[in-house]
């Protein structure tokens, strides 16, 4: 006999990165017929919703009208059908941004490179932080962590056209409190038709440094060849 129901999906709208004092909605999608949803924050019960009528609703929303550092952290949700509870959802990392200062993002050798060239981003912030985050904007957001006293290096290695995109960086005061974003830097990679062998086969980023793709709304639209989990999961652990 089944002891638990399948885990629900959890995500944040419009985004998991929320500027301070702005609003955000945490969505939890379970099953039709669920009579109760619970939202947990940092392991403790945070909010409860009982949808009516349960047989016509499979998603609930928890509204946060005014984001601040106390609301930033890890959320998960569960739901109940009758007496049977679901497995907990994956963890959603909700981040507050626009805290304190604005870093500077630069790219070496420059914003226009040839496929196969090694590219490094530099994120600099002169105030007290030692963790930096590089974010490639998109339907989902790649997040890469770097460390340094006032500056962090983000080596992308030999790039391909899959690395084209808009990048920003943040200083991080803790895992869930980030600075204002840097000005965006666009990276344009064009193929080197003399040396196509320079381009690596897999244009994704180093697996040990990239966080999970979050908030993808459509499958297969990223240029990157790897497929990513679309649910909000363990971004920064």
């Amino acid at each position: 006999q089944q002891q638990t129901l399948p885990k629900p999906f959890i995500w944040a709208e419009p985004h998991f990165m929320v500027p301070k004092e702005k609003q955000v909605t945490i969505c939890c999608q379970g099953n039709y017929g669920a009579v109760e949803y619970q939202l947990h924050f940092e392991g403790s019960l945070f909010a409860v919703d009982r949808p009516k009528p349960p047989e016509r609703i499979n998603k609930v929303q928890f509204y946060i009208p005014d984001m601040n550092s106390r609301m930033a952290g890890q959320y998960s949700c569960i739901y109940r059908v009758g007496e049977l509870w679901s497995e907990p959802s994956n963890l959603l990392d909700l981040v507050v941004t626009e805290m304190y200062d604005t870093p500077t993002l630069s790219v070496h050798p420059g914003p226009e490179v040839i496929s196969g060239e090694k590219v490094t981003f530099y994120c600099r912030l002169d105030t007290a932080t030692s963790m930096f985050l590089l974010l490639k904007e998109g339907r989902s957001s790649h997040v890469q962590r770097g460390y340094g006293k006032v500056q962090a290096e983000f080596p992308l290695g030999p790039v391909t056209t899959a690395h084209r995109g808009t990048y920003r960086c943040f200083g991080s005061y803790n895992n869930h409190a980030w600075s204002f974003p840097s000005e965006p830097v666009k990276l344009l990679v064009t193929g080197d038709i003399e040396n196509t062998s320079l381009a690596p086969e897999d244009p994704t980023f180093p697996a040990d440094t990239w966080g999970t793709y979050l908030l993808t709304t459509e499958t297969g639209l990223q240029k990157d060849h790897a497929l990513w989990d679309h649910t909000a999961q363990n971004l920064l652990r």
């Epitope: 914003p111 490639k136 904007e137 808009t166 965006p184 666009k186 193929g191 080197d192 196509t196």
Partner: antibody, heavy 122, light 107 residues
Framework: DVQLQQSVAELVRPGASVNLSCTAS????????MHWVKQRPEQGLEWIGM????????KYAPKFQGKATITADTSSNTAYLHLSSLTSEDTAIYYC???????????????WGQGTTLTVSS | SIVMTQSPKFLLVSAGDRVTITCKAS??????VAWYQQKPGQSPKLLIY???NRYTGVPDRFTGSGYGTDFTFTISTVQAEDLAVYFC?????????FGSGTKLEIK
């Protein structure tokens, strides 16, 4: 609503120059790349070049080097194509197009202007 | 420059037919290929990007495939409103280049 607005037509004399404009609305051109494409009557599409309006960096097809100059004015959200020493070979429709931008850019043309018909004739 | 060799130049088909257009790049262009439709008197419109992704709002009768040098564009069931010229385009390497176009005419 994203739009790229171009003037409908230009008539110029051989040997003269012309400046074609492409005014964007619904997005900031600084956040993407703007391209120009030529189409001669009953012929295919030819990529002229592109600009990164954020820094003014340009790329051109070798064929249009010296013939075309692409600029952008971010304050008016407008990209320009300047064509010099015009001949009948330059008679064509000129389109501006943007590389897709929806909070970030992707490299395909999702929006095109309606095209400016340039006629070079004495 | 990378040359995109597109074939055929013309297609005369009946409504309901299946149509395939090919584009061959002179060198590998990864999957940086898009397909555009240009109806008479109009600007080109994006149909397919990154070789196989259908753009928002494009009917699912339009599909694309390929990687490297060989690319295919298919209309599974041609309709009267598909009368147009179809172009492939690579933006892997500058100068970016287009195929010469395929004119689709309906009987």
């Amino acid at each position: 609503d994203v739009q790229l607005q171009q003037s409908v037509a230009e008539l110029v004399r051989p040997g003269a120059s012309v400046n074609l404009s492409c005014t964007a609305s619904g997005f900031n051109i600084k956040n993407t790349y703007m391209h120009w494409v030529k189409q001669r009557p009953e012929q295919g599409l030819e990529w002229i070049g592109m600009i990164d309006p954020a820094n003014g960096n340009t790329k051109y097809a070798p064929k249009f080097q010296g013939k075309a100059t692409i600029t952008a004015d971010t304050s008016s959200n407008t990209a320009y194509l300047h064509l010099s020493s015009l001949t009948s070979e330059d008679t064509a429709i000129y389109y501006c197009a943007r590389w897709a931008y929806d909070g970030y850019y992707e490299s395909y043309f999702d929006y095109w202007g309606q095209g400016t018909t340039l006629t070079v004739s004495s | 420059s990378i040359v995109m060799t597109q074939s055929p130049k013309f297609l005369l088909v009946s409504a309901g037919d299946r149509v395939t257009i090919t584009c061959k790049a002179s060198q590998s262009v990864s999957n940086d290929v898009a397909w555009y439709q240009q109806k008479p008197g109009q600007s080109p419109k994006l149909l397919i990007y990154y070789a196989s992704n259908r753009y928002t709002g494009v009917p699912d009768r339009f599909t694309g495939s390929g990687y490297g040098t060989d690319f295919t564009f298919t209309i599974s069931t041609v309709q009267a409103e598909d009368l147009a010229v179809y172009f492939c385009h690579q933006d892997y390497s500058s100068p970016f280049t287009f195929g010469s176009g395929t004119k689709l005419e309906i009987k």
